[in-house]
């Protein structure tokens, strides 16, 4: 229903705390360079205004749209052009063009320093002094670095953060309590970020239709006892929620997500037997829990998929009468039978089925033509299964760091023109798939591996889009989202690449590397590895292993030496010479 004042309506629905958090996230995601204090001031002004509208919905400007209100606030920021360049041009436009202009200027890779965690004592002191400001800083710092982070989920992570600090700051050894717990939240939040960015990419490039197909497959796997009408309703609602968040309508998104969670909990009987535990939780935890709830037990009496989609004499008639609905039921039926497949694979199978019907239903004898369609799925299923087996075997053999290095070599050979920092970031993220997925039971590995890889490769595509340098990457990123991962996997050494000349300074290290945290040391070594491959794209695995072992030995020796500086300055050039010889 229409409300006299949209801002009053959302304030009432969400409550002050969530309202303020979401407005802060929205501003931080739009204007990523502004300080926390600048945004906090705007948030307070918007909140005070919302309260006046709650008191009197007819008050001046209360009938304005949220985009108009928020956009006017952002455009009133002083020195907008100096700080944001052409983003300031958005302010010359009217709504809704202005908001969509802001959206198009969101930066997936803002030049902001990494979000450093203060040491435990300092963190606990500032948390105790002002928990609200502390959490505000967290929302601001995450949101500006991840401009598409799923806003209601970010509120959930802030709540987790809050609970961890409340618990650990009361302990004697704050550090050992905080570190593992906060590391866990950070890891989950980073995965959440790339997954949501993939959803927004799908919406932006391929539309709601593509996202809804993704949602139907995913929901059908999780809720195999729900009927098609129920799955369609959930998919439609979930599409609306994600569309709103991806479009910057964060208050509507959070409100509608809460409504969806409420609906699911009120209709457990027709959805799934596994929801009760989630439904007993408070709002943010409930919605988060529902989003990753375990799959319901599959009905025991499901007929073979062939009955309705291959053997039925009316296949072409049913398809012609309502293509979207017929393909939707196919995707639903296939997905509910295959919780062990990735959503990407299920969508590829549905695409193959559609292409087969398009071709066969135009022929003289359609059933003879589409009769073998399920057998034709086999190679499409085998390819990701082999990928999982090969990569998990390699991960088990090498461990996470070694596995990341193997991926780094592979991807540098596929796309040597891509910047080294991007290749290292991608390889490190891709390599984490081992730790994340390879330890899972067999039937959960494929969906975990492929859907995670797809999300990481989406980020590679977004970064490459800004400065396209590799035809290989452009080719894979231009196709449909579900074909990206197979496209990247199929890439081989880029034969068009002219190797980089050997620069000694690229491989020259100093004693400061010794005091770096382990993660930073790894990044330094991986940067050197990518540069080696760019210098010798056809180096064998054995050659690269020799060089990297030598390099590790050099670091170990010099970092243990009494006079580190001398060791680095004398042994460094020897290492460079040995590298050149080993790769000659």
């Amino acid at each position: 229903e229409a409300h006299k004042s949209e801002i009053a309506h959302r304030y009432n629905d969400l409550g002050e705390q969530h309202f303020k958090g979401l407005v802060l996230i929205a501003f931080s995601q739009y204007l990523q360079k502004c300080s926390y204090d600048e945004h906090a001031k705007l948030v307070q002004e918007v909140t005070d205004f919302a309260k006046t509208c709650v008191a009197d919905e007819s008050a001046a400007n209360c009938d304005k749209s949220l985009h108009t209100l928020f956009g006017d606030k952002l455009c009133a920021i002083p020195n907008l052009r100096e700080n944001y360049g052409e983003l300031a041009d958005c302010c010359t436009k009217q709504e809704p063009e202005r908001n969509e202009c802001f959206l198009q200027h969101k930066d997936d890779n803002p030049s902001l320093p990494p979000f450093e965690r203060p040491e435990a004592e300092a963190m606990c002191t500032s948390f105790k002094e002002n928990p609200t400001t502390f959490m505000g800083h967290y929302l601001h710092e995450v949101a500006r670095r991840h401009p598409y982070f799923y806003a209601p989920e970010l509120l959930y992570y802030a709540e987790q953060y809050n609970e961890i600090l409340t618990q650990c700051c009361a302990e004697a050894d704050k550090e050992s309590c905080l570190t593992p717990k906060l590391d866990g939240v950070k890891e989950k939040a980073l995965v959440s970020s790339v997954r949501q960015r993939m959803k927004c990419s799908s919406m932006q490039k391929f539309g709601e239709r593509a996202f809804k197909a993704w949602a139907v497959a995913r929901l059908s796997q999780t809720f195999p006892n729900a009927d098609f009408a129920e799955i369609t309703k959930l998919a439609t609602d979930l599409t609306k929620v994600n569309k709103e968040c991806c479009h910057g309508d964060l208050l509507e998104c959070a409100d509608d997500r809460a409504e969806l969670a409420k609906y699911m909990c009120e209709n457990q009987a027709t959805i799934s037997s596994k929801l009760q535990t989630c439904c007993d939780k408070p709002l943010l935890k409930k919605a988060h829990c529902l989003s990753e709830v375990e799959h319901d037990t599959m009905p025991a009496d499901l007929p073979a998929i062939a009955a309705d989609f291959v053997e039925d004499q009316e296949v072409c008639k049913n398809y012609a009468e309502a293509k979207d609905v017929f393909l939707g039921t196919f995707l639903y039926e296939y997905s509910r039978r295959h919780p062990d497949y990735s959503v990407s694979l299920l969508l590829r199978l549905a695409k193959k089925y559609e292409a087969t019907l398009e071709k066969c239903c135009a022929e003289a004898n359609p059933p003879a033509c589409y009769g073998t369609v399920l057998a034709e799925f086999q190679p499409l299923v085998e390819e990701p299964k082999n990928l999982v087996k090969t990569n998990c075997d390699l991960y088990e053999k090498l461990g996470e760091y070694g596995f990341q290095n193997a991926i780094l070599v592979r991807y540098t050979q596929k796309a040597p023109q891509v910047s080294t920092p991007t290749l290292v970031e991608a390889a490190r993220n891709l390599g984490r798939v081992g730790t994340k997925c390879c330890t899972l039971p067999e039937d959960q590995r494929l969906p975990c591996v492929e859907d995670y890889l797809s999300a990481i490769l989406n980020r590679v595509c977004l970064l490459h889009e800004k400065t396209p340098v590799s035809e290989h990457v452009t080719k894979c990123c231009s196709g449909s989202l579900v074909e990206r991962r197979p496209c990247f996997s199929a890439l081989t050494v880029d034969e068009t690449y002219v190797p980089k000349e050997f620069k000694a300074e690229t491989f020259t290290f100093h004693s400061d590397i010794c005091t770096l945290p382990e993660k930073e040391k790894q990044i330094k070594k991986q940067t050197a590895l990518a540069e080696l491959v760019k210098h010798k794209p056809k180096a064998t695995a054995e050659q690269l292993k020799t060089v990297m072992d030598d390099f590790a030995q050099f670091l170990d020796t010099c970092c243990k030496a009494a006079d580190k500086d001398t060791c680095f300055s004398t042994e460094g050039p020897n290492l460079v010479t040995r590298c050149k010889d080993a790769l000659a």
């Epitope: 809704p96 063009e97 969509e100 959206l103 198009q104 927004c200 919406m203 932006q204 490039k205 391929f206 539309g207 709601e208 239709r209 593509a210 569309k243 991806c246 479009h247 979207d324």
Partner: nanobody, 124 residues
């Protein structure tokens, strides 16, 4: 291949009304999002109004309350009712269809199909 054909343009006095129509050649139209854009001489193409396949609407601020977008799925047609026309509404009006239902509605690259345009001239 979807074809879009606009009609209803013409010359009208300031304050007057016109109703533009856009007929689509395919049934798939009912699942597409539709929009009207306009282009005045020497200016960029500008978004005017959008209607989601389920019926929700979005308007450019300066036409809100004056223009109404609607659709008749049985006739595969989308309409733009323009009241209280102003001199600055003079432009070629284009109908556009987005079969994928993309997220950015004011951006012309979100649309797969375009009509050839119909001229609207508002005189004083």
């Amino acid at each position: 291949q979807v074809q879009l054909v606009e009609s209803g343009g013409g010359l009208v006095q300031a304050g007057g009304s016109l109703r533009l129509s856009c007929a689509a050649s395919e049934r798939a139209f009912s699942h597409s999002n539709m929009a009207w854009f306009r282009q005045a001489p020497g200016k960029e193409r500008e978004f005017v109004a959008h209607i989601h396949w389920r019926g929700s609407t979005t308007y450019l601020d300066s036409v809100k309350g004056r223009f109404t977008i609607s659709r008749d799925n049985a006739k595969n047609t989308v309409y733009l009712q323009m009241n209280g026309l102003r001199l600055e509404d003079t432009a070629v009006y284009y109908c556009a269809a987005d079969s994928a239902r993309r997220i950015l509605v004011t951006v012309s690259t979100s649309y797969d199909y375009w009509g050839q345009g119909t001229q609207v001239t508002v005189s004083s």
